[in-house]
């Protein structure tokens, strides 16, 4: 067990310009408050996922009010440390969030009104017992400097805070096979505190509070032997002795999840939900009040002034759940044009572009006609994210610059032979045949299968196709 | 700032019609996509149906063939005709549109407008 603090330093402009305007004014006075989200691991999680380790609410800072004219200077900021009480180990690494929050003290209908400011993310490696770790981060033009510290509450020592220390017996050493406590010299490392009633023969752990069983035995307390008859759901080690699977402790095996929580297994652990009123890895914090800000994204939290009575959030369009942690997706409703993929980041939707458009919704296309010639006359026509030409006659290619070989296809039927032409193609015709591309045969007769040939023009002359 | 105002809602029987609007108000604005969610009581809040970016109309399994999403690009309205209505069609239904301001893409959604089908 142990406590996250959190310190505040500074709020205010970035450098650099488009210096922010002051959130408050003369007309509008307002404070700041902030509120951080822990939660455990380095993975990249969405902003309203819960917070596993804990979430904490600073105090409300003095009330500010803009000097007209004057640039937006660091904000009058609350008194105090935002701490986070962890009932676990400490994990070592850990991802958070921490909001600015503004609240606004005009004369607002139905109380003061609370707006978002500014929200920041990170991940972090953080030992606990050590140092303060400096940190700056930026949300726009805004600028944010804080410090943390993870520290274990007596008697839990270590950098996961998982060691117990106890006062020494005996003034000169500690017991058997039991360590001084560093840095508490005067004090002795004490054996992990299992899981009460968790069996000493049969169980283990290597935590406080868990209960782990040894090859051949189950159960919440490990009291339980593992039936070796029927060998069915295998999913523990070999046992030596009966040759097959015996099933191992399910990582919900006894339900780890304390205050009615249901747990469902994940790929590598478990996860627990939790009834309102309840949070944690385990469901294990208990008598959350309005107080301790459990209402996330803005939600409003009614009702929860003692921890004997539930609070309730009234969540801001567009987030849901008991603590208005679960954001609706926007994304079913396909802003993206163009097929493009749409991408709820939470304070932003962005669309990623298909090959050819751009935008922050797709809509330009980028190989549109615009400012694209087709060359010889050709005329620009525009389709599925690209342009092509359709050209005049006697020219090809992409923007119609190649001259075509109007032979190339071999247009002149029977054996006569073709000539490229200015305009077009010539065909002269083998003995027998007429007609522009020698389609006609010319009849014994003298007479053609087709009206007169034009005056001057005899059958077996080169026809010109235009 | 756009204002979206939803209304029609209101009591009906299983079987019945409603017709629902969403008026779009503001200065200078553009729709990029605009359709309706809905959140029963103790549920998350699901879209329903609408006019995707590319203005093609889209619709979840659980409303094909029963509602119907419309526009009236002169009022800036969009409709949401709702026909043999079921009991677990009960809900608040909100309009949300993606709407274009200036240069930036911002998301609104309306105050929402209660639907409740009991016999």
């Known amino acids: 067990a142990g406590v996250f603090e959190l310190q505040i330093h500074s709020f205010g402009p970035g450098p650099g310009p488009g210096a922010p305007r002051s959130p408050c004014s003369a007309r509008l006075p307002c404070r700041l408050f902030f509120r951080v989200c822990l939660k455990p691991g380095l993975s990249e999680e969405a902003a309203e996922s819960p917070c596993a380790l804990g979430a904490a609410l600073s105090a409300r800072g003095p009330v500010y009010t803009e000097q007209p004219g004057a640039p937006a200077p660091d904000l009058p900021l609350p008194d105090g440390l935002l701490q986070v009480p962890f009932r676990d180990a400490w994990p070592g690494t850990f991802s958070f969030i921490i909001e600015t929050w503004r609240e606004e003290l005009g004369d607002q209908i139905g109380g003061p009104a609370w707006s978002l400011l500014a929200r920041v993310a990170g991940r972090r490696r953080l030992a606990a017992g050590g140092p303060w770790a400096r940190d700056i981060q930026r949300a726009g033009a805004w600028e944010l400097r804080f410090s943390y510290r993870a520290r274990c509450e007596p008697p839990a020592v270590g950098t996961a805070c998982t060691r117990l220390c106890r006062p020494r017996s005996a003034p000169s050493r500690c017991g058997p096979g039991l360590r001084p406590c560093a840095p508490l010299e005067d004090e002795c490392e004490a054996p992990l505190v299992c899981r009460a009633g968790c069996s000493p023969e049969h169980g283990f752990c290597e935590q406080p509070g868990e209960c782990r069983c040894l090859e051949g035995w189950t159960g919440p307390l490990c009291t339980v032997p593992v039936s070796t008859s029927s060998c069915l759901s295998p999913r523990g080690p070999s046992s030596a002795t009966t040759g097959c699977l015996v099933p191992g402790p399910g990582p919900c095996d006894g339900n780890p999840c304390a205050n009615g929580g249901s747990c469902s297994e994940t790929p590598r652990s478990f996860e627990c939900t939790c009834p309102r009123g309840f949070y944690g890895l385990r469901c294990e914090v208990s008598g959350v009040t309005c107080a301790d800000g459990p209402c996330f994204n803005g939600g409003l939290c009614v009702g929860g002034a003692d921890p004997d009575s539930a609070y309730i959030c009234h969540c801001p369009p567009g987030f849901q759940g008991s603590n208005c942690e679960k954001r609706v997706d926007r994304c079913s409703l396909q802003p993206c044009r163009n097929g493009g993929l749409c991408l709820d980041l939470g304070h932003a939707l962005r669309c990623r572009c298909r090959a050819g458009f751009a935008g922050p919704r797709c809509e330009h296309d980028l190989d549109d006609c615009a400012g694209r010639a087709c060359a010889n006359g050709g005329t620009c026509v525009e389709g599925g994210g690209a342009h092509r030409c359709s050209c005049a006659l006697g020219f090809g290619g992409r923007d119609c610059r190649e001259r075509a070989d109007p032979c190339a296809a071999r247009p002149c039927a029977h054996g006569g032979r073709c000539y490229a032409h200015f305009s077009g193609l010539v065909c002269a015709c083998a003995p027998g045949y007429m007609g522009a591309r020698c389609e006609f045969p010319v009849h014994p007769d003298g007479a053609s299968a087709l009206p007169a040939a034009p005056p001057g023009l005899r059958p077996g002359d080169p026809q010109r196709y235009l | 700032e756009v204002q979206l105002v939803e209304s029609g809602g209101g009591e009906v029987q299983p079987g019945g019609s409603l017709r629902l609007s969403c008026a779009a108000s503001g200065s200078d604005f553009s729709i990029n996509a605009i359709g309706w969610y809905r959140q029963a009581p103790g549920k998350q809040r699901d879209w329903v149906a609408g006019f995707t970016g590319d203005g093609v109309t889209t619709y979840a399994e659980s409303v094909k063939g029963r509602f119907t999403i419309s526009r009236d690009n002169a009022k800036n309205t969009v409709y949401l005709q709702m026909s043999s209505l079921r009991a677990e069609d009960t809900a608040v239904y909100y309009c949300?549109?993606?709407?274009?301001?200036?240069?930036?893409?911002?998301?609104?959604w309306g105050q929402g407008t209660l639907v409740t089908v009991k016999p």
């Open positions: 949300a549109a993606d709407v274009k301001i200036g240069g930036d893409y911002e998301w609104f």
